[in-house]
Amino acid sequence: MVPEEEPQDREKGLWWFQLKVWSMAVVSILLLSVCFTVSSVVPHNFMYSKTVKRLSKLREYQQYHPSLTCVMEGKDIEDWSCCPTPWTSFQSSCYFISTGMQSWTKSQKNCSVMGADLVVINTREEQDFIIQNLKRNSSYFLGLSDPGGRRHWQWVDQTPYNENVTFWHSGEPNNLDERCAIINFRSSEEWGWNDIHCHVPQKSICKMKKIYI
Amino acid sequence: LGEPQLCYILDAILFLYGIVLTLLYCRLKIQVRKAAITSYEKSDGVYTGLSTRNQETYETLKHEKPPQ
Amino acid sequence: LGEPQLCYILDAILFLYGIVLTLLYCRLKIQVRKAAITSYEKSDGVYTGLSTRNQETYETLKHEKPPQ
């Protein structure tokens, strides 16, 4: 048998018990709330900061590219790869055919103003993609030059020049004074490269890395 | 609905369920305690067993530091 | 941690909390029921009050369709 308690003590005990239980309830609910808040707010902030980053990234490009065309990369909603709207995309790069006729130096500067470079062609597949967008009766500057006139060809983006991945027309390059490269069409050999004088105005192809946001 | 959205909805449901259940549990716990007290008053502790049992249940929620 | 991962972890926490509390609640409910039965046997329904109260608690969890 439990010894008889005073009703007063029992009331007091009950009151303490209720306080303990409700305190626990409050603590539990608070913990739940913290969990829930973290679950809701952190991702929201995460998304928000990501959006802010994206916007600032977009703002960087906006002065040159008022609009971008973006596609979702893979399944993740986070990763979008974009190219400026009139540009075409292939693999991890964007391409722009400049129809204005300019010297090689001016063409390169024109590309760099847009955050790009004159095109560097690394593979046959890349060249095959590029030529789909070119006109047969035009020539286009590549990002390839020989500033010393000593046949030390160099790409504008510092990619090493690899003799095995070049697409010169037969007999080209053929003139030490011609220090810049173009891509053009010859009926006998289709599309290929040719060395020409750099100041002679040509159309050009700009290439830039895709913008990931 | 996207995967993440679904996750947040589930979060909300579980959160509400957790709150409701916490409140119900505490309410029941207090009812049991009150009932135990009433039982003492009315029949000299017929429910001693129940009382102890409640204590056990309480122990499971009470978080004490293990002895050093 | 990435955004979705965080959501899933919190889901798991809330889910476990819900399960533990559900089990505790059911255990307590069963104790109360047992206690109520014992009370009838020993003292002819001293705990009618408690029984009704439990019923109320049960009502809040029982989900009935509203009348058409």
Epitope: W104, T105, Q108, K109, S112, D117, S145, P147, G148, G149, Q154, V156, D157, Q158, N175, D177, E178, R179, C180, H197, C198, H199, V200 | - | -
Partner: antibody, heavy 119, light 111 residues
Framework: DVQLQESGPGLVKPSQSLSLTCSVT?????????WNWIRQFPGNKLEWMGY???????NYNPSLKDRFSITRDTSKNQFFLKLNSVTTEDTATYYC????????????WGQGTSVTVSS | DIVLTQSPASLAVSLGQRATISCRAS??????????IHWYQQKPGQPPKLLIY???NLESGVPARFSGSGSETDFTLNIHPVEEEDAATYFC?????????FGGGTKLEIK
């Protein structure tokens, strides 16, 4: 080896026109390169004036506005400078020079001709 | 126009020592690896002579004691070891942007 030789009056009166000739030997001006005029003021300051390229296109220093022009005579393998409305500030040694197409370095210079603008 | 500032305006170096001449551009004259700056040597009564093109490439016939370096806006011409015949005025020139411009010159004397 290529050789460039400037010729023209050593003294010009203010407001008159200055005309200079550059005769090139050892290389055809229609075959390649840029053919430049550069002047050096007393005190050694050098100023690029402009060029005419092997294909006849030209490029002038905007600071000379419309006072300056370059022409050529491929049959004589010569190119010419004409500077209108000269002032005393145009007193300088005038060089004709061959420029590399790219990167636009001046790889061959004439000996230069001294021009004084004075009344 | 791009302004090229050379320093010092003059310097005297002992025979066999190193001479260093600086050329600073008011804006970048680099196109990636290609730094469109060139160095000339001018001796009294003679026209300038090309020494180095594209910042670091030695023109044929120029002795290997001449070397150039730099990128973007800061470029340097080094002569080591300095010889008697190197007494001259040295100019830098940029061809990155029209109009092409020259530095003010650095007069090198041999002690």
């Amino acid at each position: 080896d290529v050789q460039l030789q400037e010729s023209g009056p050593g003294l010009v009166k203010p407001s008159q026109s200055l005309s200079l000739t550059c005769s090139v030997t050892g290389y055809s001006i229609a075959s390649g390169y840029y053919w430049n005029w550069i002047r050096q003021f007393p005190g050694n300051k050098l100023e690029w004036m402009g060029y005419i390229s092997f294909d006849g296109t030209y490029n002038y220093n905007p600071s000379l506005k419309d006072r300056f022009s370059i022409t050529r005579d491929t049959s004589k393998n010569q190119f010419f400078l004409k500077l209108n409305s000269v002032t005393t500030e145009d007193t300088a040694t005038y060089y004709c020079a061959r420029g590399v197409d790219y990167p636009n370095a001046i790889d061959w210079w004439g000996q230069g001709t001294s021009v004084t603008v004075s009344s | 126009d791009i302004v090229l500032t050379q320093s010092p305006a003059s310097l005297a170096v002992s025979l066999g020592q190193r001479a260093t001449i600086s050329c600073r551009a008011s804006e970048s004259v680099s196109m990636h690896v290609t730094h469109l700056i060139h160095w000339y040597q001018q001796k009294p009564g003679q026209p300038p002579k090309l020494l180095i093109y594209v910042a670091s490439n030695l023109e044929s016939g120029v002795p290997a004691r001449f070397s150039g370096s730099g990128s973007e806006t800061d470029f340097t011409l080094n002569i080591h070891p300095v010889e008697e015949e190197d007494a001259a005025t040295y100019f830098c020139q940029q061809s990155f942007e029209d109009p092409w411009t020259f530095g003010g010159g650095t007069k090198l004397e041999i002690k």
